[in-house]
């Protein structure tokens, strides 16, 4: 079943290469288990950046070595991507799946364009 997911159009990463945005999905109510996947689109290529499953009882849990962190509240997920470099500039798409209980719903946002500007290196000081 289809479901709407919303995310901001543009986000500017911090000088430390950290970008945060909210992914909001249309609630079917009583979704006990939700999977959130962050996809990066570059041209026609779509790659998975990170993914996490959370339950109505427990917090969002990304893998320990993930480049993402996040918190969940109701039908909103606050996602943070770390370690971004200028070459990481691109369209980041939030995909939300309501896994349990049935019926299964899936929704994809239109994507958030994340701009990453590498900081200028500090000049050498004598």
């Amino acid at each position: 079943k289809g479901m709407h997911a919303a995310q901001p159009a543009v986000v500017l990463a911090s000088s430390r290469g950290v970008a945060s945005f909210v992914c909001e999905y249309g609630s079917s109510g009583n979704a006990a288990e939700v999977r959130v996947t962050m996809l990066r689109q570059a041209g026609s290529q779509m790659t998975e950046v990170c993914a996490a499953t959370y339950t109505v009882e427990d917090e969002l849990a990304f893998l320990d070595d993930s480049t993402c962190t996040g918190t969940s509240s109701g039908n909103k997920v606050n996602l943070t991507i770390q370690g971004l470099r200028a070459m990481g500039t691109g369209l980041y798409i939030c995909k939300v799946e309501l896994m349990y209980p049935p019926p299964y719903y899936v929704g994809m946002g239109n994507g958030t364009q994340i701009y990453v500007i590498d900081p200028e290196p500090c000049p050498d000081s004598d």
Epitope: S28, A32, R35, Y100, P101
Partner: antibody
């Protein structure tokens, strides 16, 4: 704390109707499905079905289609089980139980006795 | 419908013994995305059931570590490493993977 409190015991005659309530507190009522479970005297647990507390959509197990109805009073964080045209075999304890990815908590149970 | 068959029906044990309860499903209860919604509940006399284990092997918070769940596909086991008096009651397995969701028939744990 999170709890479900059910209405008291009922004594009914065959053919009558009963409505059992289950009042939730300590959490957001519409975030979790509410399930109903039957336990006949000295018997095991039998899943009756559940109601989506956000949409109001009920799902019934085959044995509980027809005379049984789940409903909600969302503003009062209360779920209801109504049984019409009562039969002797409806004599049992009925539990409501909140479900996310498991059942917790359960109501204390409502004992229904159907006897002429 | 998925039939959940528990064995034994009755399990007499001595305090301190290990107890093992089996639960078999009539078909695989792996849900579409890979999770298995197999749970274990304990119902003490005159009380409502309480969750012990969810998703096959996850112990609910506050449940003693002498309780453990295992299994996959159609074959599941609840083990109690050292039975204590407070563990006595009826144990039920439950599958929440395929509607209609179903309980096992129950296993009564009692003192030998």
């Amino acid at each position: 704390q999170i709890q479900l409190v059910q209405s008291g015991p009922e004594l009914k005659k065959p053919g009558e109707t009963v409505k059992i309530s289950c009042k939730a507190s300590g959490y957001t009522f519409t975030n979790y499905g509410m399930n109903w479970v039957k336990q006949a005297p000295g018997k095991g647990l039998k899943w009756m079905g559940w109601i989506n507390t956000y949409t109001g959509e009920p799902t019934y197990a085959d044995d509980f289609k027809g005379r049984f109805a789940f409903s909600l009073e969302t503003s009062a964080s209360t779920a209801y089980l109504q049984i019409n045209n009562l039969k002797n075999e409806d004599t049992a304890t009925y539990f409501c139980a909140r479900r996310g990815t498991y059942y917790r908590p359960w109501g204390q149970g409502t004992t229904l006795t159907v006897s002429s | 419908d998925v039939l959940m068959t528990q064995t034994p029906l009755s399990l007499p044990v001595s305090l301190g013994d290990q107890a093992s309860i089996s639960c078999r499903s009539s078909q695989s209860i792996v849900y579409s995305h890979g999770n298995t919604y197999l749970e274990w509940y304990l119902q003490k006399p005159g009380q409502s059931p309480k969750v012990l284990i969810y998703k096959v092997s996850n112990r609910f918070s506050g449940v003693p570590d002498r309780f453990s769940g295992s299994g996959s596909g159609t074959d599941f086991t609840l083990k109690i490493s050292r039975v204590e008096a407070e563990d006595l009651g009826v144990y039920y397995c439950f599958q929440g993977s395929h509607v209609p969701w179903t309980f096992g028939g129950g296993t009564k744990l009692e003192i030998k």
